[in-house]
Interface confidence: low
Amino acid sequence: TMCSAQDRTDLLNVCMDAKHHKTKPGPEDKLHDQCSPWKKNACCTASTSQELHKDTSRLYNFNWDHCGKMEPACKRHFIQDTCLYECSPNLGPWIQQVNQSWRKERFLDVPLCKEDCQRWWEDCHTSHTCKSNWHRGWDWTSGVNKCPAGALCRTFESYFPTPAALCEGLWSHSYKVSNYSRGSGRCIQMWFDSAQGNPNEEVARFYAAAMHVN
């Protein structure tokens, strides 16, 4: 059974109860490369941030290159998506309880800024996959995800005909594509410049207030 985010009283500055997350957010000076924007306040450790940049990292044994080499232009979005998932302390309003062996909580319908989704989709045009939902249905017999029998490798566009199909379908509706733009304070940015602070803090505050939770 699932209960809504409203069942949590701590929606701001929180870490999800999942496989690699810290129990509480805090500074992490040595966050690696694409995860570095979260240095000042993170739910991930430096070693998690280092590991998630690797192809088929030990975090989940997930292989981005399951249909041949994923273009770097595309892969950087999946790395950024993983940084957001592992490191962000600002996704409390969208945490849901789940009954899974590897995690007790997940995100649902995080309002991703429309430009971040559009860019992700465009940048992955030249890469290939064999599935439209990457949460389930893989062949894990080798210990690493492989395309299931009968699943053909095609361009991303074949499996994700629109930006929303990618961002919403990929991880079982962890994201929903917002109508709001980057910088609006009403949608979560996957990419941001930490020199200006973390724009997602304001977004979390807005949605937490809208849920009538302090």
Epitope: A73, D123, C124, H125, E157
Partner: antibody, heavy 117, light 107 residues
Framework: QVQLKESGPGLVQPSQTLSLTCTVS????????VSWVRQPPGKGLEWMGA???????DYNSALKSRLSISKDTSKSQVFLKMNSLQTEDTAIYFC???????????WGQGVMVTVSS | DIQMTQSPASLSASLEEIVTITCQAS??????LAWYQQKPGKSPQLLIY???RLADGVPSRFSGSRSGTQYSLKISRLQVEDIGDYYC?????????FGGGTKLELK
């Protein structure tokens, strides 16, 4: 090996229409986006517009009213049409393949177009 | 449109010298910035993307950095083959816009 090659007339009369073709090889237009960039003699670069893999287009607003980009994926060709040419449209016209949605990773050799009577 | 202000417009440097070119964006573009090199009579070539990442085959003497909305391209030890024009380009939004260019010459 990725290659792009522009072709078209070297000289166009003022007020006439420019038609250029970009023929590509080493990649497919069904899964790659291509744009046009121009460079007036001795000057900088100007992005003109793009055609995305799905067929939709984006144009530089300064040129939008007289520019059209299309493609024939079966022939691996991208076309640029621009009407009402003036002398300030004299430039080298490049077609480029995107690195993702963001940068220009591969460039054609360019074609010099002079607008003059 | 996002304006990219590049400086200097031209630059004379000696072999093995350190060269720095900068680009100022008129608004926040995150890390969506590329640098290109254009040799005389040739097409531009992608050198650096995402502000700091080296494109394939580019020598390690080239590097990119960022401070807020200011971006820099550094050549650590100038070589003869580095002579040419350099352009920055923002990839944050359409229209994609370029800096005015920097002409790099040998002293």
């Amino acid at each position: 090996q990725v290659q792009l090659k522009e072709s078209g007339p070297g000289l166009v009369q003022p007020s006439q229409t420019l038609s250029l073709t970009c023929t590509v090889s080493g990649f497919s237009l069904t899964s790659n986006s291509v744009s046009w960039v121009r460079q007036p003699p001795g000057k900088g670069l100007e992005w003109m517009g793009a055609i995305w893999s799905g067929g939709s287009t984006d144009y530089n607003s300064a040129l939008k009213s007289r520019l059209s980009i299309s493609k024939d994926t079966s022939k691996s060709q991208v076309f640029l049409k621009m009407n009402s040419l003036q002398t300030e449209d004299t430039a080298i016209y490049f077609c480029t393949r995107y690195y993702g949605y963001t940068y220009f990773a591969y460039w054609g050799q360019g074609v010099m177009v002079t607008v003059s009577s | 449109d996002i304006q990219m202000t590049q400086s200097p417009a031209s630059l004379s440097a000696s072999l093995e010298e350190i060269v720095t070119i900068t680009c100022q964006a008129s608004q926040d573009i995150g890390n969506w910035l590329a640098w290109y090199q254009q040799k005389p009579g040739k097409s531009p070539q992608l050198l650096i993307y995402d502000a700091i990442r080296l494109a394939d085959g580019v020598p390690s003497r080239f590097s990119g950095s960022r401070s807020g909305t200011q971006y820099s391209l550094k050549i650590s030890r100038l070589q003869v083959e580095d002579i040419g024009d350099y352009y920055c380009q923002q990839g944050q939004s359409n229209p994609r816009t370029f800096g005015g260019g920097t002409k790099l010459e040998l002293k």
